[in-house]
Each structure stands twice: as C-alpha cells, then as structure tokens.
C-alpha cells in the first residue's frame, strides 16, 4: 500500500430502486477490481424541496476525480442528481454538498483541468 492513501475494500451500499433492480436495499458492498487499480465509494442523492433522497451508494471504479478524497463531497453547482466519491472503507456513509464558484468554460474544447 502507498503511504497516505486510503485503500477502499468496502463501501456502504444503498439502492432506492432495489425492488426494480432486484438487489438488496442496504448493506455493505465489497469492492472488486484489478489489483493495481484504485477503488472508491460513491453516493448519489436528490434534493427535493429541501428534502434529501438518497438514490444509490456503493463502490466506484478507478477515477482520478476521487483520488485522495477522504470525504464524499459534491462540488458541482445545483446538479439534478448529486454525486460524490471518496477513498477509504465506508467513506460514503456521510456525504455533503459544497458548491464551488462556477468557472466559465473556455471556447475551445477543454483539456484536463487541474483537480480541485
């Protein structure tokens, strides 16, 4: 293991559509993947008139947007469905929303921006 990195082996699992999808509604999900790839946890939720409705929680595949994030925080401004990802076992138990200032996109096709 690399020093200072939280390896993710399991995440909190939740599925609001568990009946339709024929899954459990809630539990702990073991995260599978190639041994040399990073694994993460995620949470998705909706804010309906100030009421938080969790959509899904579970494991997320190797994603640079999630690297070295110990907390699950959505930073996008007012998305339709909120999404956050993090590293570390069960790091998706808690999630939060801290919108960043919207930066105007350049007119040319953007390339890899610096991660926040």
């Amino acid at each position: 293991a690399i020093l200072g990195r939280s390896e993710t082996q399991e995440c909190l699992f939740f599925n609001a559509n568990w009946e339709r999808d024929r899954t459990n509604q809630t539990g702990v999900e073991p995260c599978y993947g190639d041994k040399d790839k990073r694994r993460h946890c995620f949470a998705t939720w909706k804010n309906i008139s100030g009421s938080i409705e969790i959509v899904k929680q579970g494991c997320w595949l190797d994603d640079i947007n999630c690297y070295d994030r110990t907390d699950c925080i959505e930073k996008k401004d007012s998305p339709e469905v909120y999404f956050c990802c993090c590293e570390g076992n069960m790091c998706n138990e808690k999630f939060s929303y801290f919108p960043e200032m919207e930066v105007t996109q350049p007119t040319s096709n953007p390339v890899t921006p610096k991660p926040p």
């Epitope: 997320w60 190797d62 998305p79 921006p113």
Partner: antibody, heavy 115, light 111 residues
Framework: QVQLVQSGAEVKKPGASVKVSCKAS????????INWVRQAPGQGLEWMGT????????SYAQKFQGRVTMTRDTSISTAYMELSRLRSDDTAVYYC????????WGQGTLVTVSS | QSALTQPASVSGSPGQSITISCTGT?????????VNWYQQHPGKAPKLMIR???KRESGVSNRFSGSKSGNTASLTISGLQAEDEADYYC???????????FGGGTKLTVL
C-alpha cells in the same frame, strides 16, 4: 468478463437522428462512466462525451454540444448516444468505452449518413 | 485538430525497439499522469495498453512501456514483433471534471 455490446449498423439520411445503444455486462454498470468515441473512415479517434452511469451527469465535447445526447437505463445496464441533424461527415464507427480510462470497448457501430 | 500531437508513422524491424511520442501542453500532459495508450488493429476496436503514463494493463506484454518527460508522453515497444503492427493512440482520462482528447494516431509498420 466485462463486455460492452453495441447495436447494429445504421444507414441514415442527412438531417435525421441516430441512437446507438451499448449494453454492459460483467461488472456493476452504475460503478463508472461510459465514454463515447467515434472514428471516421481512415481517420483517428474522436472523443464525443461521457456519462456518469449512476447519476446520469454528462459532459460533451464542444464540437458536439447541442447535437449529442447521452442517456442510460440502469435497469438494463445500457447506455445510449443520440446524434441529431446528421451530416455526411458524421459517417463513422461509434464506440462506447467503460470508465475514464477507456479500459473496455464495445465492438463499434457503423453509422452511414447518405442521401 | 488534435490537442495531442503524435507522429503520423513510425517503422522498425523485428527485434528492434521503437518509441512513439505524444506531445501536449503544460496544462494537460505536463501537469498530470493521466495519459493512456491504445492499440488498434485494422477493423477492430481500440485496446487499452498503458494507463496513467506507465501502468501496463493486465495481459499486456512487458515489451510495452510508457514514460513521460515534460509535456511529452512516450510509448516504447521493445523486441518488435509482426503482431505489433497497428495504429497507436494516446489519450487522456475522461469523466467528471475531465474532458477527453486523443492524439491523431501513429501507424506502426514492422518491416
């Protein structure tokens, strides 16, 4: 094993729309992104956009903004790419690929735009 | 026009080593280790060979290696074999806050 299976070849007239599907299996569909890439005959790869399979959030290449729509149906582990107002230079093979690293690819769907 | 620049073609004899370059800018290739390399044989879908500059995908021969210096990423193939003849593309991670981009592709000919 991970598989992405795409819909069959399409022939469309200029001005029409096409919708290509990409059915995923062998992994949890809602655990990553699906990216879409196209390749015109004899040309290189061109990134079109991406969809977060769990949240449905999308990012499109500027070139396709306003003409492309990416959606997914999590109940059948399938992603879709719809391209509207087709022109002859949209003739290409369209690929879906899993995740931000494009680690698995569909077999490709040939879309021919011809009057 | 590609944001990443590759040579149109390279060639080598069996057993030789070749290197394909992929040049970007200080804000993409130069800043992050998020460049990947794909191999594409005629009529086939691309295949991920190297991700994150230098990590070989499982099942990929150790004859393939990736590196980076400044704003240029490189793919080196040692001990060239006939089956290595293909098109090779560099590309970036795409998803979330990151927009994808590919190089123009390099045709490798094994003489």
């Amino acid at each position: 094993q991970v598989q992405l299976v795409q819909s069959g070849a399409e022939v469309k007239k200029p001005g029409a729309s096409v919708k290509v599907s990409c059915k995923a299996s062998g992994y949890t569909f809602t655990s990553s992104y699906i990216n879409w890439v196209r390749q015109a005959p004899g040309q290189g790869l061109e990134w079109m956009g991406t969809i977060n399979a769990v949240s449905g959030s999308t990012s499109y290449a500027q070139k396709f903004q306003g003409r492309v729509t990416m959606t997914r149906d999590t109940s059948i582990s399938t992603a879709y790419m719809e391209l509207s107002r087709l022109r002859s230079d949209d003739t290409a093979v369209y690929y879906c690929a899993r995740g931000g690293w494009f680690d698995y690819w569909g077999q490709g769907t040939l879309v021919t735009v011809s009057s | 026009q590609s944001a990443l620049t590759q040579p149109a073609s390279v060639s080598g004899s069996p057993g030789q080593s070749i290197t394909i370059s992929c040049t970007g800018t200080s804000s993409d290739v130069g800043s992050f280790n998020y460049v990947n390399w794909y191999q594409q044989h005629p009529g086939k879908a691309p295949k991920l060979m190297i991700r994150g500059v230098s990590k070989r995908e499982s099942g990929v021969s150790n004859r393939f290696s990736g590196s980076k210096s400044g704003n240029t990423a490189s793919l080196t193939i040692s001990g060239l074999q006939a089956e290595d003849e293909a098109d090779y593309y560099c590309g970036t991670f795409a998803g979330g806050a990151y927009y994808g981009v590919f190089g123009g592709g390099t045709k490798l000919t094994v003489l």
